[in-house]
């Protein structure tokens, strides 16, 4: 399987909410001997590999934000800790995997990574990630709503998030 990032750039005004999204593509094993670990973190564009470094999102580590389930089951992060920080990560039955950030500030700007680890009970493991940029803007140049820019493999037309 692979991870797709429908949008590579999100440009949002301060105070807005945004949902960053990744999508699992390809066959996903739903057997009892496989489980999926999914999480989000901030990172930097490393020399060797983007998303190598795992920094917290609003003081929550990738371990605080992780989801853990089999196949395409739906899952949500533990609400109390994440919601106190205005965060919620979720996963649906269709391979979509997201983190919602509420009341954005300029400090939220940066590179965000989703990580999916397919863990099999016999040693083998497949680890993939996706990366996207969030720019939070303030002042007269800021958009009124979040504007999302598709990844290069998609249609390059700007799409305004609902």
């Amino acid at each position: 399987f692979k991870v797709a990032t429908p949008y590579s750039l999100y440009v949002c005004p301060e105070g807005q909410n945004v949902t960053l999204t990744c999508r699992l593509l390809g066959p996903v094993d739903k057997g009892h001997d496989v489980t999926f670990y999914k999480t989000w973190y901030r990172s930097s564009r490393g020399e060797v590999q983007t998303c190598s470094e795992r920094r917290p999102i609003r003081n929550l580590t990738f371990q605080d934000l992780h989801l853990h389930h089999g196949g395409h089951q739906a899952a949500n992060t533990s609400h109390d800790l994440a919601q106190r920080h205005g965060l919620e990560s979720a996963s649906d039955h269709h391979g979509n995997f997201s983190i919602t950030m509420r009341n954005l500030t300029l400090l939220d700007s940066g590179l965000y990574c989703c990580l999916v680890v397919e863990i099999r009970h016999h040693h083998s493991e497949h680890r993939v990630h996706g990366a996207m940029e969030l720019q939070v803007q303030t002042g007269k140049d800021a958009p009124s709503n979040c504007v999302v820019y598709p990844s290069s493999s998609q249609d390059s037309e700007n799409i305004t998030a609902a």
Partner: antibody, heavy 120, light 107 residues
């Protein structure tokens, strides 16, 4: 804050077995692999095997296959490592450690270690 | 199994020195290389993960680099609390394997 607390030191006779426990607190137990790593006196670190509690079955280093059994009790957030047919060269400090995710995450939290002495 | 070879096995250095430890893997492991510090009688402590990423709470004088088969741990200015044994570890393939360790002693 995640903490791994191991059982106390043991002195065992050659040929016997030892079972070391590792109780986790402060984090999600089932999602993470717990690895067991040993260190003989003055020697380096050696991975013995690990378990992801939600699977219930463990993976072992070939060297220890057949002699080590790793189990986990999700209800008490405790992992166990049992080593049988002990010999003097099994004298070592045995550590449990948590993998950040899956089998191949780095080992970010460690227990304090349990000294097992095998002596006749 | 992937073999990890560290060099040197020991070194003597003074406070303030720049110290470099190398680790070589028997086959390519991409950037799946971690570094640990261990002091006598204590459990190892994770310093660097993914070859170059600093674990939370670790001082910035520690840095890691490398990819493929050759990796380096650097301590830019050795502090008294840095005298310890350092281990590299690969987590590219199971089983997890460690280097034999490098002991950093006071000159």
């Amino acid at each position: 804050q995640v903490q791994l607390v191991q059982s106390g030191a043991e002195v065992k006779k050659p040929g016997s077995s030892v079972k070391v426990s590792c109780k986790a607190s402060g984090g999600t137990f089932s999602s993470y692999a717990i690895s067991w790593v040993r260190q003989a006196p003055g020697q380096g670190l050696e991975w013995m095997g690990g378990i992801i509690p939600i699977f219930g079955t463990a993976n072992y280093a070939q060297k220890f296959q057949g002699r080590v059994t790793i189990t986990a009790d999700e209800s008490t957030s405790t992992a166990y490592m049992e080593l049988s047919s002990l010999r003097s060269e099994d004298t070592a400090v045995y550590y449990c450690a948590r993998n950040t995710f899956g089998w191949s995450g780095e080992l970010d939290y460690w227990g304090q270690g349990t000294l097992v002495t095998v002596s006749s | 199994d992937i073999q990890m070879t560290q060099s040197p096995s020991s070194l003597s250095a003074s406070v303030g020195d720049r110290v470099t430890i190398t680790c070589r893997a028997s086959q390519s492991i991409s950037n799946r290389l971690n570094w640990y510090q261990q002091k006598p009688g204590k459990a190892p402590k994770l310093l660097i993960y993914s070859a170059s990423s600093l674990q939370s709470g670790v001082p910035s004088r520690f840095s890691g680099s490398g990819s493929g088969t050759d990796f380096t741990l650097t301590i830019s200015s050795l502090q008294p609390e840095d005298f310890a044994t350092y281990y590299c570890q690969q987590n590219h393939d199971n089983p997890i394997t460690f280097g034999q360790g490098t002991k950093v002693e006071i000159k």
